[in-house]
Interface confidence: medium
């Protein structure tokens, strides 16, 4: 079956692919980057990372996977640094374009025990 170029798509779409397990174990004080790649057509208009009903205004970045004009693949990264036990929970990435909305959730568990387990 011939591939469909973005110009021939009738209805828009967004497909999100997690680049790290959606269940994340991290030791107290460690860093973790929550990363997704996503395909979006038409181009994405709104992206956000949310934790505890609060939207991150920094600590994240969103950029095209390629600089080609026909690119429909993007990357979004949320950078969590020196995590505390109280910062575990669900982190959600939301993205929308003029046709659809999509989201993916990451469950982050912060191990605060004195002897650390390495996963």
């Amino acid at each position: 079956q011939p591939s469909v170029s973005p110009g021939e798509v009738d209805k828009g779409f967004i497909n999100i692919f997690p680049m790290i397990n959606t269940t994340v174990f991290v030791n107290d004080g460690e860093n973790v980057d929550l990363i997704v790649e996503y395909e979006a057509f038409p181009k994405p208009e709104h992206q956000q990372w949310i934790y505890m009903n609060r939207t991150f205004t920094d600590k994240w970045e969103d950029y095209p996977k390629s600089e080609n004009e026909s690119n429909i693949r993007y990357v979004s990264e949320l950078h969590l640094t020196r995590l505390k036990g109280t910062e575990g929970g669900t982190y959600t990435f939301l993205v929308s374009n003029s046709d659809v909305n999509a989201a993916i959730a990451f469950n982050v568990y912060v191990n605060t025990k004195h002897h650390h387990h390495h996963h």
Partner: antibody, heavy 119, light 107 residues
Framework: EVQLLESGGGLVQPGGSLRLSCAAS????????MIWVRQAPGKGLEWVSR????????DYADSVKGRFTISRDNSKNTLYLQMNSLRAEDTATYYC????????????WGRGTLVTVSS | DIQMTQSPSSLSASVGDRVTVTCRAS??????LNWYQQRPGKAPELLIY???SLQSGVPSRFSGSGSGTDFTLTISSLQPEDFATYYC?????????FGQGTKVEIK
């Protein structure tokens, strides 16, 4: 101790194959993007490849695209670089490194393993 | 691809000297610029990230500045252990290109 240790280097004939390994310890390997960088004898550093934490996304330098494959086994805390169709110009010390944060810098490096491609 | 050009390629200096290394990107890279030190026979070590942020454990005599296309690494008072090769690296685009390196030698 937080460290990376490469292995698998050696002497190989042009057109041959080699698989490098990088064993990680002391940190939660599955949470980090990992990269390979190489350095030809007496020359500068060259970025080779990158892999997302889950192994789901990869990128390569043009000089190795189609010949090298980066992969990882998070259950073994190990990063790999499969090198096929090796050329004399691939002779170098190969370093694995850990990528961190929004600035995408490499904060932890292995000691390197030497690959020599010669007949 | 983004090209990174360092200058000078080598320099001779004495202990206590102030040393400056520059790095120029072929296009705007904002502050996506990192600096590494490599001593002979050793792996590179991160000194500065995001153009001006000092990596934990790195002495304060090292500093970085710049944004856009022009960047500088400064060693305020050169110490014996600072004789090494220094590399800049852009992390703006997917192919994380390095500069060709600046070798700092003893005068």
């Amino acid at each position: 101790e937080v460290q990376l240790l490469e292995s698998g280097g050696g002497l190989v004939q042009p057109g041959g194959s080699l698989r490098l390994s990088c064993a990680a310890s002391g940190f939660t390997f599955s949470n980090y993007t990992m990269i390979w960088v190489r350095q030809a004898p007496g020359k500068g550093l060259e970025w080779v490849s990158r892999i997302w934490p889950s192994g789901g996304g990869t990128d390569y330098a043009d000089s190795v695209k189609g010949r090298f494959t980066i992969s990882r086994d998070n259950s073994k805390n190990t990063l790999y670089l499969q090198m096929n169709s090796l050329r004399a110009e691939d002779t170098a010390t190969y370093y694995c490194a850990r990528r961190v944060g929004a600035s995408r810098y490499f904060d932890l490096w292995g000691r390197g393993t030497l690959v020599t491609v010669s007949s | 691809d983004i090209q990174m050009t360092q200058s000078p390629s080598s320099l001779s200096a004495s202990v206590g000297d102030r040393v400056t290394v520059t790095c120029r990107a072929s296009q705007n890279i904002d502050n996506y610029l990192n600096w590494y030190q490599q001593r002979p026979g050793k792996a590179p070590e991160l000194l500065i990230y995001a153009a001006s942020s000092l990596q934990s454990g790195v002495p304060s005599r090292f500093s970085g500045s710049g944004s856009g296309t022009d960047f500088t690494l400064t060693i305020s008072s050169l110490q014996p252990e600072d004789f090494a090769t220094y590399y800049c690296q852009q992390s703006y685009s997917n192919s994380r290109t390095f500069g060709q390196g600046t070798k700092v030698e003893i005068k």
